[in-house]
Interface confidence: medium
């Protein structure tokens, strides 16, 4: 229903603490370069307005839309033109175009240093000195690096961060307590950021229908006991939630997400018995818990899908009368029976089923035409199953680091035009599929692998869209959301690529590499490996293995030498020459 003051309504609904957090995230995601203090000032102004409007809904500016309130604050910044350049041009537009313009300028790879974690003592001191400012900085730093982070989830991660600090800052060895816990939290939050980025890309690039289909499949797998209309209801509400968050409407998004969690908990008997473990928790934990629930058991005695979707005499009638309903029901029925399939595979099956009906229902004998439709799914199922089998075998054989390197070589050969930092980032992420999924039992491997790869490849698509350099990447990213992974898998080495000129500087190491943390040292080596492949795209795996082995030996030797810099100066050029000889 319409409220006299939207800002007062949202302040009352989400409460002051979450309101402040969501407003801070909103500004940080729009204005990624501003210092924290500038954001804190804007947040205070908006919060003061909200409080005034709660006291008197007819006070000045209380009838403004949230976009007007946020947009006017942004456009009043004196430093806007200097800091953000053409973002200032957005201010000449009226809502809703102004907000669309701000969204268009969100930067998925802002030029910001990596979020560095201070020493345990420093962290704990800052936490104890000013808790509010400490978590304000956390929200700001994460949000500006991840302009599509799912805002209510970021509030949840801030809460978890607080719980970890509360526990570990009292521990005898603060560092030993904090490091593993914060590493795990950071890992989860990075995956969460990438997952929401995929949802936003689905909605923005392929429309609501694409996300609705994705959500219908995933929720049917998770809640197979719920009936179709219940799943549809949740899908509709969830789509609204993510549309709002992806559109920068974070207060509405958090409010609607809380309403959906409440609805699901009120109807748990018709949705899933698993919900009870979530429903007594406070709102942020409740919603996070529901999102993370394991699939319910598939109900016993379900009839074969063929009964309703192949053998029934009314298949074409049902399809032609209400396509969305019938195809939605097909996806629901197939998905609730297949928690062992990935969401994208199930969506491919839905697409294949729809194409078959479209063709067959126009023939004289539709039934004869579509009778074998479910059998025709087999190649679509076999392809990702084989991919999982081959890659998990390779991972088990090579281990984490070398599996990443194998993917680094594979993807550099496929799309050598892509920038080296992007190839390193994407290949490292793709490589993590091994440790993340290959240890799972057979029935859980396929959904884990393929749905994770969809998230990682979306990151490639998003980064590539910012600076497009490869027609192949553009094609795989834009043609079909569900076929992205098979499209990339099917790419062979790019035979049109002109090898990169050799640059000795790229392969010159210095003593500073010895003091880098292990992860950063690996990234340096992997950067050199990508450059090597770009220089010699036809190098064999054995040749590359030899060169990488020699590089590793050089690092080991020089990093344990008395005079490290001298060692690199002498041994480095020798290695470059021997590598050239190895690679021909």
């Amino acid at each position: 229903e319409a409220h006299k003051s939207e800002i007062a309504h949202r302040f009352n609904d989400v409460g002051e603490e979450h309101f402040i957090g969501l407003v801070l995230i909103t500004f940080s995601q729009y204005l990624q370069k501003c210092p924290y203090e500038e954001h804190a000032k804007l947040v205070k102004e908006v919060t003061d307005l909200a409080k005034a409007c709660v006291a008197d809904e007819s006070a000045a500016n209380c009838d403004k839309s949230l976009h007007d309130i946020f947009g006017d604050k942004i456009c009043a910044l004196p430093s806007l033109r200097d800091t953000y350049g053409d973002v200032a041009d957005c201010c000449e537009k009226k809502e809703p175009e102004r907000n669309e313009c701000f969204l268009h300028h969100k930067d998925d790879k802002p030029d910001l240093p990596p979020f560095a974690r201070p020493e345990a003592d420093v962290l704990c001191k800052a936490f104890h000195d000013d808790e509010k400012a400490f978590f304000g900085h956390y929200l700001y730093e994460v949000a500006r690096r991840h302009p599509y982070f799912y805002a209510p989830e970021l509030l949840y991660y801030a809460q978890k961060y607080k719980a970890i600090l509360t526990e570990c800052c009292e521990a005898a060895d603060k560092g030993a307590c904090l490091t593993p816990k914060l590493d795990a939290l950071e890992g989860k939050s990075l995956i969460s950021a990438a997952q929401e980025r995929l949802r936003c890309a689905s909605i923005q690039k392929f429309g609501d229908r694409a996300y609705k289909a994705w959500a219908l499949v995933r929720l049917s797998q998770r809640f197979p006991k719920a009936d179709f209309t219940d799943i549809s209801k949740i899908v509709t509400d969830l789509t609204k939630v993510h549309k709002e968050c992806c559109h920068g409407d974070l207060l509405e998004c958090a409010d609607d997400r809380a309403d959906l969690a409440k609805y699901m908990c009120e109807h748990q008997e018709t949705i899933s018995s698993h919900l009870k473990e979530c429903c007594d928790k406070p709102i942020l934990e409740k919603a996070h818990c529901i999102y993370g629930l394991h699939n319910d058991e598939t109900p016993a005695g379900l009839p074969a899908v063929a009964e309703e979707f192949v053998e029934d005499k009314d298949v074409c009638k049902n399809y032609e009368e209400a396509k969305d309903l019938f195809l939605g029901k097909f996806l629901y029925e197939y998905s609730r029976r297949h928690p062992d399939y990935s969401v994208v595979l199930l969506l491919r099956l839905g697409k294949a089923y729809e194409a078959t009906l479209k063709k067959c229902c126009a023939t004289d004998d539709p039934h004869a035409c579509y009778a074998k439709v479910l059998d025709e799914f087999q190649p679509l199922v076999d392809e990702p199953k084989n991919l999982v089998k081959q890659n998990c075998e390779l991972y088990e054989q090579l281990g984490d680091y070398n599996f990443q390197n194998a993917l680094l070589v594979r993807y550099t050969k496929k799309v050598p035009q892509v920038s080296t930092p992007t190839l390193v980032e994407i290949s490292r992420s793709l490589g993590k599929v091994g440790s993340k999924c290959c240890k799972h039992p057979e029935a859980e491997r396929l959904p884990c692998v393929e749905d994770y790869l969809s998230v990682v490849l979306n990151r490639l698509c998003v980064l590539h869209e910012k600076t497009p350099v490869s027609e192949k990447v553009t094609k795989c990213c834009s043609e079909s959301l569900v076929d992205r992974r098979p499209c990339f898998s099917a790419l062979g080495p790019d035979e049109t690529y002109v090898p990169k000129e050799f640059n000795a500087e790229t392969f010159t190491f210095h003593a500073d590499i010895c003091t880098l943390p292990e992860t950063e040292r690996k990234i340096k080596k992997q950067t050199a490996l990508v450059e090597l492949v770009k220089h010699k795209p036809h190098a064999t795996n054995d040749q590359l293995k030899t060169v990488v082995g020699e590089f590793t030996a050089l690092l080991d030797k020089c990093c344990s030498a008395e005079d490290k810099e001298a060692c690199f100066a002498v041994e480095g050029p020798k290695l470059v020459e021997s590598s050239k000889a190895t690679l021909g």
Partner: nanobody
Framework: EVQLLESGGGLVQPGGSLRLSCAAS????????MLWVRQAPGKGLEWVSV????????YYADSVKGRFTISRDNSKNTLYLQMNSLRAEDTAVYYC????????????WGQGTLVTVSS
């Protein structure tokens, strides 16, 4: 015993509007998804629209999208169908029914209300 009683049908000119109602009893209406189906003279049953127990989402047959609106009032145990821009091909007996939990079939429907679109 489940009872569904449709009303609101009648004769209307092309381009006109009608609002059908369906009073439900004998089951928990507010936990049941409902639908409207229709049967044109000499034809089989045709889906028209479906509504979830909470009021959203809704589904419409392609032939009525943008012209018909399904709604419900759970406090009155009543289902509605607002029909605008009526066409001759909308002439049919309209039935309300409980949405099936499994097959695209349904267990209960009323006696129907006749809608005739003619000039």
């Amino acid at each position: 015993e489940v009872q569904l009683l449709e009303s609101g049908g009648g004769l209307v000119q092309p381009g006109g509007s009608l609002r059908l109602s369906c009073a439900a009893s004998g089951f928990t209406f507010d936990t049941s998804s409902m639908l409207w189906v229709r049967q044109a003279p000499g034809k089989g049953l045709e889906w028209v629209s479906v509504i979830h127990q909470s009021g959203t989402p809704t589904y419409y047959a392609d032939s009525v999208k943008g012209r018909f609106t399904i709604s419900r009032d759970n406090s009155k145990n009543t289902l509605y169908l607002q029909m605008n821009s009526l066409r001759a091909e909308d002439t049919a007996v309209y039935y309300c029914a409980k949405f099936p939990s499994s097959r695209m079939k349904f267990d209960y429907w009323g006696q129907g209300t006749l809608v005739t679109v003619s000039s």
